[in-house]
């Protein structure tokens, strides 16, 4: 899959899980760098991926809510990310400065199911996103005007 950032260092990847969706995220940020990421698969937190340290932000997805697009910002290391969801919310981690790229699936209806990349002592050197169809597809019209986000204004 496509990787964003200059690369280098040790590889990391979330656990491949065919039975659970991503239901939450923890992102640790310190010294203007994204240090690590951790996904919640169903009810359980997967292993923390990346470097040590930083302050951790945690977000919880609502039932039936998925991450559908990600912006990433690099300056030698991953500086920030914005994750957009299927319920018109977004979550902001770190700072969106430097080289900004957007990541989204090639197939309509696919959602984020995994994260992979490379890290060094100071932080994440590259990151990639695995997209796939959700286990249970939504069967109703899209939601209208959901108005709150955990830590930022609504938008997509």
């Amino acid at each position: 899959g496509k990787m964003y950032g200059p690369g280098g260092g040790k590889y990391f990847s979330t656990t491949e899980d065919y039975d659970h969706e991503i239901t939450g995220l923890r992102v640790s940020v310190g010294l203007l760098l994204v240090k690590s990421v951790q996904v919640k698969l169903g009810d359980s937190w997967d292993v923390k991926l990346g470097a040590l340290g930083g302050n951790t932000q945690e977000v919880t997805l609502q039932p039936g809510e998925y991450i559908t697009k990600v912006f990433v910002a690099f300056q030698a290391f991953l500086r920030g990310m914005v994750m957009y969801t299927s319920k018109d919310r977004y979550f902001y981690f770190g700072k969106l400065d430097g080289q900004i790229s957007s990541a989204y699936p090639s197939q309509e209806g696919q959602v984020l199911v995994g994260i992979y990349g490379q890290y060094q002592l100071l932080g994440i050197k590259s990151i990639g996103f695995e997209w796939n169809y959700p286990l249970e597809e939504p069967t109703t019209e899209p939601p209208v005007n959901l108005t709150y986000s955990a830590n930022s204004p609504v938008g997509r």
Epitope: Y18, Q107, E108, L135, E137, T140
Partner: antibody
Framework: QVQLVQSGAEVKKPGASVKVSCKAS????????MHWVRQAPGQGLEWMGW????????NYAQKFQGRVTMTRDTSISTAYMELSRLRSDDTAVYYC??????????????WGQGTLVTVSS | DIVMTQSPDSLAVSLGERATINCKSS????????????LAWYQQKPGQPPKLLIY???TRESGVPDRFSGSGSGTDFTLTISSLQAEDVAVYYC????????FGQGTKVEIK
């Protein structure tokens, strides 16, 4: 009810460009990707690409990369497909299509009426 | 790219008889995560846009008569019209939504 209404037939010369429009009604255009599919006379269906009208993200079939541009104007609920450097084998009916509401996968349940583009010198 | 190959190219069937169309993909359309086959069937009549009949290989779209059924998994799929009616004369296409979107070349169904 859901409707996709396309612009009228076009006749173009080789090397020219054509821009086909698809006006959506009965739903919010921002909630669904718009796909474009073409069909040469007496031939099969060929997927060209999609645009997400919410943010303008696009994904084009490899065959059309560099020649096709998909855009949208959400204020008038309209998607556009522009094909440049036209050749005679681009003569086809061009359709816009939208998925069903029953699943998020791109099963094309709603189609425009088609726009015939004829490329001839 | 995934290549979709239909057989036969054309088919003549008597009214009330069974019509069977095959579709083969160059790679499996079974998604190991969702355990679904990302294959659809469309019907196209002359001068009209295609109409969605079946998706996920076997799920009938709302309003589609139950004489239409889909089966198969992985790389081999079948559309069956159990009792051909005059209004079923059309070209039928399979389409994969596993990796981007590709249609088969079409199968023309006529009355014998």
């Amino acid at each position: 009810q859901v409707q996709l209404v396309q612009s009228g037939a076009e006749v173009k010369k080789p090397g020219a460009s054509v821009k086909v429009s698809c006006k959506a009604s009965g739903f919010n255009i921002k909630d669904y990707y718009m796909h474009w599919v073409r069909q040469a006379p007496g031939q099969g269906l060929e997927w060209m690409g999609w645009i997400d009208p919410e943010n303008g993200n696009t994904n084009y079939a490899q065959k059309f990369q560099g020649r096709v541009t998909m855009t949208r104007d959400t204020s008038i609920s309209t998607a556009y497909m522009e094909l440049s450097r036209l050749r005679s084998d681009d003569t086809a009916v061009y359709y816009c299509a939208r998925r069903a509401i029953t699943t998020a996968t791109a099963w094309f349940a709603y189609w425009g009426q088609g726009t015939l583009v004829t490329v001839s010198s | 790219d995934i290549v979709m190959t239909q057989s036969p190219d054309s088919l003549a069937v008597s009214l009330g008889e069974r019509a069977t169309i095959n579709c083969k993909s160059s790679q499996s359309l079974l998604n190991s995560r969702t355990r679904k086959n990302y294959l659809a069937w469309y019907q196209q009549k002359p001068g009209q846009p295609p109409k969605l009949l079946i998706y996920w290989a076997s799920t009938r779209e709302s309003g589609v008569p139950d004489r239409f059924s889909g089966s198969g998994s992985g790389t081999d799929f079948t559309l069956t019209i159990s009792s051909l009616q005059a209004e079923d004369v059309a070209v039928y296409y399979c389409k994969q939504s596993y990796n981007l979107y590709t249609f088969g070349q079409g199968t023309k169904v006529e009355i014998k």
